[in-house]
């Protein structure tokens, strides 16, 4: 959808990019899967949620995630990732009061219970990629994306245009 230089220019201002409103502009309930059609699932274990990347059995129900879309004051790039010329950020919530967080120190993606207003670690820049895929870039760490590593979600640094379209940072959204 865009070259890496575009991404770097696009994301340079993310650290100081503020969200236009405290309220999402819209939300969408979807199942999240990898480029290779593995499902992202969430399991409650010892009073905390674990995130898994796994193949589901044929009739097994997929977990849903609520994507909440926010407008950023930072202008969007040319690739149509924004609304009304503004960049889109999302938060991802698989259940009430829990949100995906970027742990940049551990390079991990975690589920945390928290109240609004959400911390910056819960916000990801939404990129529309090829083949109806999306990717999620950390607001707190431009150039770092949610990706798949060893059957878990992890934070993956993207530093070249080849890596930008690498399958392990691409995800599919579907209603089923």
């Amino acid at each position: 959808a865009f070259g890496i230089s575009g991404v770097q220019k696009y994301t340079r201002a993310l650290h100081d990019s503020s969200i236009t409103g405290i309220s999402p502009i819209t939300e969408y309930l979807a199942s999240l899967s990898t480029y290779n059609d593995q499902s992202i699932t969430f399991a409650l274990e010892d009073e905390s949620y674990e995130i898994y990347v796994e193949d589901l059995k044929k009739d097994e129900k997929k977990d849903k995630v609520l994507l909440s879309y926010y407008e950023s004051q930072h202008p969007s790039n040319e690739s149509g990732d924004g609304v009304d010329g503004k960049m889109l950020m999302v938060t991802l919530s698989p259940t009430k009061d829990f949100w995906l967080h970027a742990n940049n120190k551990e390079h991990s993606v975690e589920l945390h219970k928290c109240e609004k207003p959400l911390p910056d670690q819960a916000f990801f820049v939404l990129h529309n990629m090829h083949s109806n895929c999306v990717s999620f870039e950390c607001k707190t760490d431009p150039g770092v994306f949610i990706g798949v590593k060893d059957n878990h979600l992890a934070l993956i640094k993207v530093d070249s245009s080849e890596n930008l379209c690498t399958e392990n940072i691409l995800f599919k959204l579907s209603e089923t």
């Epitope: 819209t26 969408y28 259940t95």
Partner: antibody
């Protein structure tokens, strides 16, 4: 710039079916993160939400009208439509189509909507 | 369903004055999912505010929204001639979404 335009007959006989179409220009229904919906306003009165739809075809209706309403989408034509059956004089109104933001309520597991871009509206009179 | 009551029904003011419109909900909602619309005669409504306080694209900053729980307010800091219209509040905290009955802001 996104624009919405309603079209359909301005006069419908009682007990018949009201059919309206909304054509979206300046943006694709399919690529949008938003929902689409219908709202009506009887003469001299307030606004009433009829229902909403996502491009996938998933629908959300006002319970007070649900038994009579069908909303559908045709992404190939960038249109969505309203059908209201068994109309009476009480269905006389200006009908608006609109783009909608959908927000989810975890407690009752339902979506609700606000409308950010509206069509100009079309007047539908129910009379014999 | 949530019933929204707007007051006053009519507000008579002069250009340059401050307008304060009230919207009260029959039940409290924590989300602040409340919108305000402006409607002029023969025209479609126009979104002014969503999320109780976020201005929609292209809306002048003289329009501001506030409130939470059951009580919400739309304020027009300094009325311009084009602001005389009917204003509706709408909740989208839960389905079905509902509108208030409207407040007409007219020239005094």
């Amino acid at each position: 710039q996104l624009q919405l335009q309603e079209s359909g007959p301005g006069l419908v006989k009682p007990s018949e079916t009201l059919s309206l179409t909304c054509t979206v220009s300046g943006g694709s229904i399919r690529s949008s993160i938003f929902y689409w919906g219908w709202i009506r306003q009887p003469p001299g009165k307030g606004l009433e939400w009829i229902g909403s739809i996502y491009y996938s075809g998933r629908t959300y209706y006002n319970p007070s009208l649900k038994s009579r309403v069908t909303i559908s989408v045709d992404t190939s034509k960038n249109q969505f439509s309203l059908m209201l059956t068994s109309v009476t004089a009480a269905d006389t109104a200006v009908y608006y189509c609109a783009r909608a933001g959908g927000l989810y309520n975890w407690n009752d597991e339902s979506f609700s909507f606000y409308m950010d871009v509206w069509g100009n509206g079309t007047t539908v009179t129910v009379s014999s | 369903e949530i019933v929204l009551t707007q007051s006053p029904g009519t507000l008579s003011l002069s250009p340059g004055e401050r307008a304060t419109l009230s919207c009260r909900a029959s039940q409290s909602f924590s989300s602040s999912y409340l919108a305000w619309y402006q409607q002029k005669p023969g025209q479609a409504p126009r979104l002014l505010i969503y999320g109780a306080s976020s201005r929609a694209t292209g809306i002048p900053d003289r329009f501001s929204g506030s409130g939470s729980g059951t009580d919400f307010t739309l304020t027009i800091s300094r009325l311009e001639p084009e602001d005389f219209a009917v204003y509706y509040c709408q909740q989208y905290d839960r389905s079905p979404l509902t509108f208030g009955g409207g407040t007409k802001v007219e020239i005094k």
